[in-house]
């Protein structure tokens, strides 16, 4: 299995729709897999970050993403001292919401890309594909994606470099 | 030691406008996202605006948007905070804050809407 | 509108132990809301506590703790003081809006 997430970078502002797009490509399918959408909260704030960039937590991060490139404090972080939740799963056509998002418009669709018809407080965070075959075991199952969600439209682009901003309309 | 001392506080009429500033001492002022946080008479905090360490960024509370202004002037190591159109119900201690976590806060200073 | 709800008043003996919510009007608290906790006492300028749910500032003494407990945010006082009776807030990150609760007055009998 292949799961790549195309845009891993969202912003969008309250109350606005998002998809969180996700695909997913198999060396064999003789079965359809399962589509596992996961949350977990930001390992640290990205709009303080962004806000106060001389703060000593942001200085000790600058040294370790010096010390190794790829790695990301805001989603690399043990998953006791954050919030896990499942948003959405789906197998063949069914798609199941975790029991946080009962009642919300939040579906699974396309090949696996994760839609909220309308975000809110307490969707920001990262945002895990993962895709599971008996039949399929190797290659990398899982991606991710970042989402904020804003209560203002006003300097995404400034505060958050490298996010992609969503509808900005009120 | 971080000191953080507003200024600018009074009494104004109705309608009338008022700065308030924030002079900071103690750390790099260019460096860090700022808040100014209110508190009424026997009431409890209620947060007002922040802006970024080099002023790109603000965030109003609904209360005060399209009346206040947050800005700073890195240069002097001072934070501001312009109110127009004021109300009644901006009679208030205004506290202004280092940091997002707000680690730090001011004495305050009194700002009493009155006719 | 968003609502943070804290108890409006806790009484506690001294060197007991008191634990202060923290809900929110839009759902659960999680850590990605930040939760931030601030102490005043009267006549005095409001001081920091806990940020990030549970990070204590240098200065914060150790019998304060902040964690997740439920679908809140809970401020913990283990061995209670007679100088930690003072007024006690909550504060929530909404995606560039911050909300404050209404605060705890905690009592310190005796």
């Known amino acids: 299995i292949q799961v790549t997430v195309s845009d891993p970078y969202h912003v969008v502002i309250l109350f606005q729709p998002v998809t969180l797009p996700c695909t997913y490509q198999m060396t064999s399918t003789p079965t359809q897999p399962i589509v596992i959408w996961k949350y977990k909260s930001f390992c640290r704030d990205r709009i303080a970050d962004a806000f106060s960039p001389a703060s000593v937590d942001n200085q000790l991060n600058a040294q370790l993403v010096a010390g190794n490139p790829g790695y990301n404090p805001y989603v690399e972080c043990q998953d006791s001292v954050r919030t896990v939740r499942v948003v959405a799963t789906k197998q063949g056509n069914a798609v199941t919401l975790g029991d946080y998002y009962q009642g919300r418009r939040i579906t699974i669709t396309g090949n696996a890309d994760l839609t909220f018809d309308e975000t809110a407080w307490g969707d920001s965070g990262v945002y895990y594909c993962s895709v599971v075959s008996a039949q399929d075991l190797e290659g990398n199952n899982e991606a991710y994606a970042e989402l904020i969600v804003l209560g203002r439209t006003s300097g995404v682009a400034e505060l958050l470099p490298g996010f992609q901003a969503g509808p900005m309309e009120d | 030691e971080v000191q953080l001392v507003e200024s600018g506080g009074g009494v104004v009429q109705p309608g009338r406008s008022l700065r308030l500033s924030c002079a900071a001492s103690?750390?790099?002022?260019?460096?860090?996202?700022m808040h100014w946080v209110r508190q009424a008479p026997g009431k409890g905090l209620e947060w007002v605006a922040v802006?970024?360490?080099?002023?790109?960024?603000?965030y109003y509370a609904d209360s005060v948007k399209g009346r206040f202004t947050i800005s700073r002037d890195n240069s002097k190591n001072t934070l501001y905070l312009q109110m127009n159109s004021l109300r009644a119900e901006d009679t208030a201690v205004y506290y202004c804050?280092?940091?997002?976590?707000?680690?730090?806060w001011g004495q305050g200073t009194l700002v009493t809407v009155s006719s | 509108q968003t609502v943070v709800t804290q108890e409006p008043s806790l009484t506690v003996s001294p060197g007991g132990t008191v634990t202060l919510t923290c809900a929110s009007s839009?759902?659960?608290?999680?850590?990605?809301?930040?939760p931030t906790w601030i102490q005043q006492k009267p006549g005095q300028a409001p001081r920091a506590l806990i940020h990030?749910?549970?990070y204590k500032h240098s200065w914060t003494p150790a019998r304060f703790s902040g964690s997740l407990v439920g679908d809140k945010a809970a401020l913990t006082l283990s061995g209670v003081q007679p100088e930690d009776e003072a007024e006690y807030y909550c504060?929530?990150?909404?995606?560039?809006?911050?909300?404050f609760g209404g605060g705890t007055k905690v009592t310190v009998l005796g």
């Open positions: 504060l929530l990150q909404y995606g560039g809006a911050w909300v």
């Open positions: 103690g750390f790099t002022f260019s460096s860090y996202g």
């Open positions: 802006i970024s360490y080099d002023g790109s960024n603000k």
């Open positions: 804050a280092k940091d997002l976590n707000m680690d730090y």
């Open positions: 839009t759902g659960a608290v999680t850590s990605g809301y930040y």
């Open positions: 990030t749910t549970s």
